[in-house]
């Protein structure tokens, strides 16, 4: 309702009027515009995308479009040297050779410069020597290993199956328990869903294909050799030793194909349970090595990709506020792919085209938001969200001062089943109210709202009659913007059934099989679920920018404040002796949260009886809003994480995907009774609480009335 | 609402096996300790032990360590109490009860747990 | 297995006050937060008093709560019909690793 009274709006120039300009076959055509040969970060492909965007939005009616370019480290394959995996027998032949290529899909045969299975930023290296299996290779994973059944990784080749948490993750793990050598690889149990055939006949993963990615570990530094500032003409570059994240070891993905050759002949120690067996027809031993007959024979990786400083485009279009021209609400999605793209990033991209051309179709009839809206096309996310790192380190003065929120916009399906949004709980309200708004585009909700097949479909495990919104984590280009500047984000995607469907992403993820026609023939033919997230992040752009009163609700900050002040403190419950012994107190942390609950309390009723008619008091209480996240920012940082600052929130340090709460004191109790020094380690639990006890209190303090 | 809701009241005979369950709603059930608390007709409460349901730690009070087991499965927010071999001085109610910060803020209604031959 | 000791029973004519003593050591109540509870006659307990002396929303402010040492005690000040119930005291204690109940105080409205 705010919305209506933005500036030069008349009747017709509302949200509604953004929202029926939005058009399910646009989207489509844009889709198919952007997907139909590859468009790998630093290629000339995708530069030349960026300029086709640039000129689009300027042709749409935003105010300026600019391309914003950054010399970032990126990593390529050898052209003539291809990389591979061998099994090769005691006189050192290889008797087994995985493939150089995915099979490609009908119709793509002839298309050039498809990159092969790589994984991006891995060193050169030719280990050989035997095999270990590692699950999942997660902490837990390495823990069953080396604690529960002695096994020792170190100078081994490990194999993983991908899913459950960032393969950066799993890298890391292998590195810190010695092995020489990585081989991640898709299993049918996470990358097959029962029922469904492979593609081009469904929207499974075929034996060949494989999942591309990055493996590094950057923890939110962006361009590994200029941490903290621009990738710019002037950069100071650190040396490669010096780089931030790289892995040391080799690493190479593959498919569930050339898996089974590795995996059936593994002998060793049977999986220690169910838990670790995935679909093939396989035992699923862990090793190390081969059984029996095999047992003379190694694996060898043949890794030969570069790592180069390369050229990336941001494409960044403004439309200027109206009323608050120094306030800007950014949407951005990246644009560059492993491929095609097919879901990640282009059903992403084409979104973001139509929200423009929307806007851009109510500025030419004279409307304008109230703030500023900026527009991203980020390239390099698949490299380690480097694109948009670079920019916000360039802008960071202008973003900390100016920024009130950050929408993204990566893929916008990964599912066709429900909704599925991840954002601070300061937005909570605005996607209640929103999709309240918003026609559900299920089967069997015909005339219902969004929010009621969402509720339905996937509910909140704590409130009744309430959807689940989950905690922002990383991956995806919001990180920068989220957990380094503390600007209110937020993501919405449609999204599978998790109950029915537990594979880990969806299957032909980061695949040659990503296609225009996976989305077109098995995913949202009609193009409604497109609709639907564009409906949803526009409508949440349209209302960040041009409602009077921010639509941000400080007290929903308070209700997750005390849930993850429970339980981090249940966790510290574990040890309830040593909680004694070191006289470790969570009062103060309580305290502080009793505290913000009851000062967002008032700041909330003052919010609803200030006058709003003075502009002085009105910038007031919105800034209040806007620069509570900002409050959430330690200037230093989470331990050996400098770059992941906020202190309620950080991508876990066991999986970048998910989010943790109270990082720093998570990561202080975890693994706790294994540190040497217990005095040190609860000393730095101890630290910690007071730590997120000052921060929350400091955030609650810049909600008071300000004299 | 934060809710614990037990199973319904059980009649068993000496040596026979149970299992009595408590559902969370209304919370993060995973990320809170659930404590099982005894109470014997006329007489007051006796704690018997706890279970973190995200990893399923579990302590026991002295004198129910071996006596009882107390598991959960936190896919469907629910903690269990069961016996091998029921005795006649099991006969009693059993509460669930969710501990905080705050020590043991919310109870379920309780289980009437009967064992007669 | 109760290590906390109250008094089997208190009593008061309605507008009355009544206090409740809760005895323990220095493994529990000397080292650790008191929670009070009401348990009315064929119910649940229901969490009445937490930190010692903080009320949960809902509970009236005539329940109010202190500490000193090893001791704790529950006062009800004008005392209501609706108060009758059996009243147990509660704390964490560091040698058991975990909860010791008081042995219950029956408050009876005359």
């Known amino acids: 309702k705010s919305s209506n009274e933005a500036t030069n709006i008349t009747p017709k120039h509302n949200m509604k009027a953004f929202l029926d300009e939005l058009k399910a076959e646009n989207i489509k055509k844009f889709l198919y515009n952007f997907t139909q040969i590859p468009h790998l970060a630093g290629t000339e492909q995708n530069f030349q995308l960026a300029k086709q965007i640039q000129s689009q939005w300027k042709e749409f009616g935003l105010d300026s479009v600019e391309l914003a370019h950054y010399d970032v480290l990126l990593s390529y394959p050898n052209k003539t040297h291809p990389n591979y995996i061998s099994i090769i027998n005691e006189d050192g032949n290889e008797i087994f050779n995985t493939s150089l290529f995915e099979p490609p899909p009908p119709g793509y045969e002839n298309v050039s410069d498809i990159v092969p299975p790589f994984s991006a930023f891995s060193p050169q290296g030719m280990p050989e020597g035997d095999l270990v299996y590692v699950n999942y290779a997660r902490t837990e994973d390495f823990f069953k290993l080396e604690r529960d059944m002695k096994i020792n990784c170190s100078g081994k080749i490990v194999i993983a199956r991908y899913g459950k948490v960032f393969r950066g993750n799993k890298v890391k793990n292998a590195q810190l328990a010695g092995a020489k050598g990585v081989i991640l690889y898709s299993d049918p149990a996470d990358y097959f869903a029962p029922g469904v055939k492979s593609y081009p006949d469904g929207w499974n993963l075929p034996g060949g294909g494989v999942q591309r990615g990055n493996i590094l570990n950057l923890n939110g530094a962006g361009d590994p050799l200029t941490p903290g500032y621009p990738a710019n003409e002037y950069a100071y570059r650190r040396g490669i030793a010096e780089a931030v994240g790289l892995p040391s070891i080799p690493v190479h993905p593959i498919g569930y194909y050339d898996a089974q050759k590795l995996l059936e002949k593994m002998g060793g120690s049977a999986p220690p349970d169910s838990s670790w067996r995935g679909s093939l027809k396989v035992p699923y031993n862990v090793g190390p090595g081969f059984t029996g007959n095999f047992s003379t024979q190694k694996v060898k990786m043949h890794i030969h990709s570069t790592n180069e400083v390369t050229r990336i485009y941001n494409v960044i279009g403004t439309l200027r506020g109206a009323v608050e021209p120094d306030r800007y609400v950014i949407l951005g999605g990246h644009r560059d792919s492993w491929v095609f793209g097919g879901i990640d990033p282009q059903s992403g991209a084409a979104v973001v085209h139509e929200i423009v051309r929307s806007f851009g179709t109510l500025k030419k009839e004279g409307w304008r938001p109230r703030r500023t809206i900026l527009f991203a096309s980020w390239d390099a996310e698949e490299f380690g969200l480097l694109g948009s790192t670079e920019w916000a380190e360039e802008n960071s003065r202008l973003l900390q001062e100016r920024g009130v929120a950050y929408i993204n916009a990566d893929s916008s399906i990964e599912g066709n089943y429900t909704l599925r949004v991840d954002c601070t709980p300061l937005m909570y309200s605005l996607v209640h109210n929103l999709t309240k708004e918003l026609k559900s585009p299920d089967e069997g909700f015909e005339g219902k709202s969004l929010y009621e097949s969402w509720t339905k479909k996937s509910p909140s495990p704590e409130f009744s009659g309430m959807p689940r919104i989950s905690k922002l984590g990383s991956g995806n280009d919001f990180e920068v913007f989220f957990q380094r500047l503390g600007i209110a984000s937020g993501r919405a995607r449609y999204t599978k059934n998790w109950e029915t469907n537990k594979f880990s992403g969806y299957p032909l993820y980061h695949s040659v099989y990503e296609t225009y026609e996976l989305v077109e023939k098995f995913y949202d033919p009609m193009f409604k679920y497109h609709l639907t997230v564009a409906q949803v992040r526009g409508g949440m752009v349209f209302e960040l920018a041009n409602s009077i009163v921010l639509p941000f609700d400080c007290r929903d900050y308070a209700v997750v404040l005390r849930k993850y002040a429970d339980k981090i403190y249940s966790i510290s419950m574990k040890h309830p002796q040593e909680m004694k012994t070191y006289s470790v107190s969570f009062d103060s942390l309580f305290s502080a949260v009793k505290n913000f609950t009851e000062i967002a309390s008032k700041f909330s009723e003052r919010l609803q009886d200030f006058d709003k008619s003075n502009p002085i008091v009105l910038r007031m209480m919105n800034d209040q809003l806007m620069f509570l996240e900002r409050a959430f920012i330690d200037p230093l940082g989470l331990p050996d994480r400098p770059f992941y600052r906020h202190v309620i929130y950080a991508p876990s340090s066991h999986n970048k995907y998910a989010g943790e709460s109270f990082p720093g004191i998570y990561d202080a109790l975890f693994d706790i009774e294994s540190k040497v020094d217990p005095s040190k380690a609860w000393g730095e639990v101890k630290r910690q609480i007071y730590v997120a006890a000052f921060t929350v209190q400091a955030a609650a303090e810049t909600l008071s009335e300000v004299a | 609402e934060v809710q614990l809701v037990q199973s319904g009241a059980e009649m068993k005979k000496p040596g026979e096996s149970l299992k009595i369950s408590c559902k969370g709603s209304?919370?993060?059930?995973?990320?809170?300790?659930v404590g099982w608390v005894r109470q014997m007709p006329g007489k007051g409460l006796e704690w018997m032990g706890t279970?973190?349901?995200?990893?399923?730690?579990?302590r026991y009070g002295p004198a129910f360590q071996g006596q009882v087991t107390i598991s959960a499965d936190k896919s469907i927010s629910t903690a269990y109490l069961q016996w091998s071999s029921l005795k006649a001085s099991d006969t009693a109610m059993y509460y669930c009860?969710?501990?905080?910060?705050?020590?043991?803020?919310?109870w379920g209604q309780g289980t009437l747990v009967t064992v007669s031959s | 297995q109760a290590v906390l000791t109250q008094p089997p029973s208190a009593s008061g004519t309605p507008g009355q006050r009544v206090t409740i003593s809760c005895s323990g050591s220095?493994?529990?109540?000397?080292?650790?937060?008191v929670n009070w509870y009401q348990q009315l006659p064929g119910t649940a307990p229901k969490l009445l008093m937490y930190?010692?002396?903080q009320r949960p929303s809902g509970v009236p402010d005539r329940f109010s709560g202190s500490k000193s040492g090893t001791s704790a005690s529950l006062a009800i000040s004008g005392l209501q019909s609706e108060d009758e119930a059996d009243y147990y005291c509660?704390?964490?204690?560091?040698?058991?690793?975990?909860?010791?109940f008081g042995t219950g105080t029956k408050v009876t409205v005359l």
């Open positions: 220095s493994s529990n109540i000397g080292s650790n937060t």
């Open positions: 509660a704390a964490w204690d560091d040698s058991l690793n975990g909860y010791v």
């Open positions: 279970i973190y349901p995200d990893d399923s730690d579990t």
């Open positions: 009860a969710r501990d905080s910060y705050y020590g043991i803020d919310v």
């Open positions: 209304g919370y993060n059930f995973a990320s809170y300790w």
């Open positions: 930190s010692n002396n």
